[in-house]
């Protein structure tokens, strides 16, 4: 899978994590920090 950093318009897309652009899947993906979950790392689960 080809990945790159998200475009600058997606700054702030991931609330508690890093935004990655999955090129072949045509979508952004949030790699969440420890303790966070959700599509945009918006939920704290500890």
């Amino acid at each position: 899978v080809s990945i790159t950093k998200c475009n600058s318009d997606m700054n702030g897309y991931c609330l508690h994590g890093q935004c990655i652009y999955l090129v072949d899947m045509s979508q952004n993906y949030c790699r969440c920090e420890v303790g966070y979950t959700g599509v945009r790392c918006e939920h704290f689960y500890l």
Epitope: S8, D9, S26, N28
Partner: antibody
């Protein structure tokens, strides 16, 4: 199956306002950004602005600033675009577009006609 | 706002011809460009995103290339069903469409 279903065609008088809705199904709008694009008859595509329903922030194209308002109701999974002080040049098809989790998934479009 | 200058605005070519459309951005858009095809009365259809990534179901005669501020969209062998208007879209910093290119058959 993911869908963006927009409200029906509108006819408005110059100076009036119009509010177009965009109801999402199959996904949560809080996971996305909702963009709005318009296309006047025989003209090109024009980006108007976008809403982040989770954070609640909005960005607009400069030319529409002060005249367009993009909102979202996360309880009904619906986004809205309101354009005020309508003029004949605002006659166009207005599209909502989902981005973020999936690159640019479009609604079917809503024709807004401004005529006296 | 980033400006996108698309050229030509229209072109006429024969079936089987190679067709090239260019888009120039007013600043580096880091390969964040998409290409759409629009036929009359229809919503735009995404063909390519991130400069060169073809969407599922899109014929391989369509391709894209470029970097920095200069990008190219190519139809390697024009087919009758390719008659449409094509738009570039930068999505690096907010969004801006190019002015469109109407492709016709000679």
């Amino acid at each position: 199956q993911d869908q963006l279903v927009q409200s029906g065609a509108e006819v408005k008088k110059p100076g009036a306002s119009v509010k177009v809705s965009c109801k999402a199904s199959g996904f949560n709008i809080k996971d996305t950004y909702i963009q709005w694009v318009r296309q006047a008859p025989g003209q090109g595509l024009e980006w108007m602005g976008r809403r982040d329903p989770l954070r609640g922030n909005t960005k607009y194209r400069e030319k529409f600033e002060g005249r367009v308002t993009i909102t979202a109701d996360t309880s009904t999974n619906t986004a809205y675009m309101e354009l005020s002080s309508l003029r004949s040049e605002d006659t166009a098809v207005y599209y909502c577009v989902r981005s973020g989790t999936l690159f640019d998934f479009w609604g079917q479009g809503t024709l807004v006609t401004v005529s006296s | 706002d980033i400006q996108m200058t698309q050229s030509p605005s229209s072109l006429s070519a024969s079936v089987g011809d190679r067709v090239t459309i260019t888009c120039k951005a007013s600043q580096d858009i880091h390969k964040y460009i998409a290409w759409y095809q629009q036929k009359p009365g229809q919503a735009p259809r995404l063909l390519i995103q991130y400069t060169s990534t073809l969407q599922p179901g899109v014929p391989s005669r369509f391709s894209g290339s470029g970097s920095g501020t200069d990008y190219t969209f190519t139809i390697s062998s024009l087919q009758p069903e390719d008659i449409a208007t094509y738009y570039c879209l930068q999505y690096d910093n907010l969004r801006t469409f190019g002015g469109g290119t109407k492709v016709e058959i000679k």
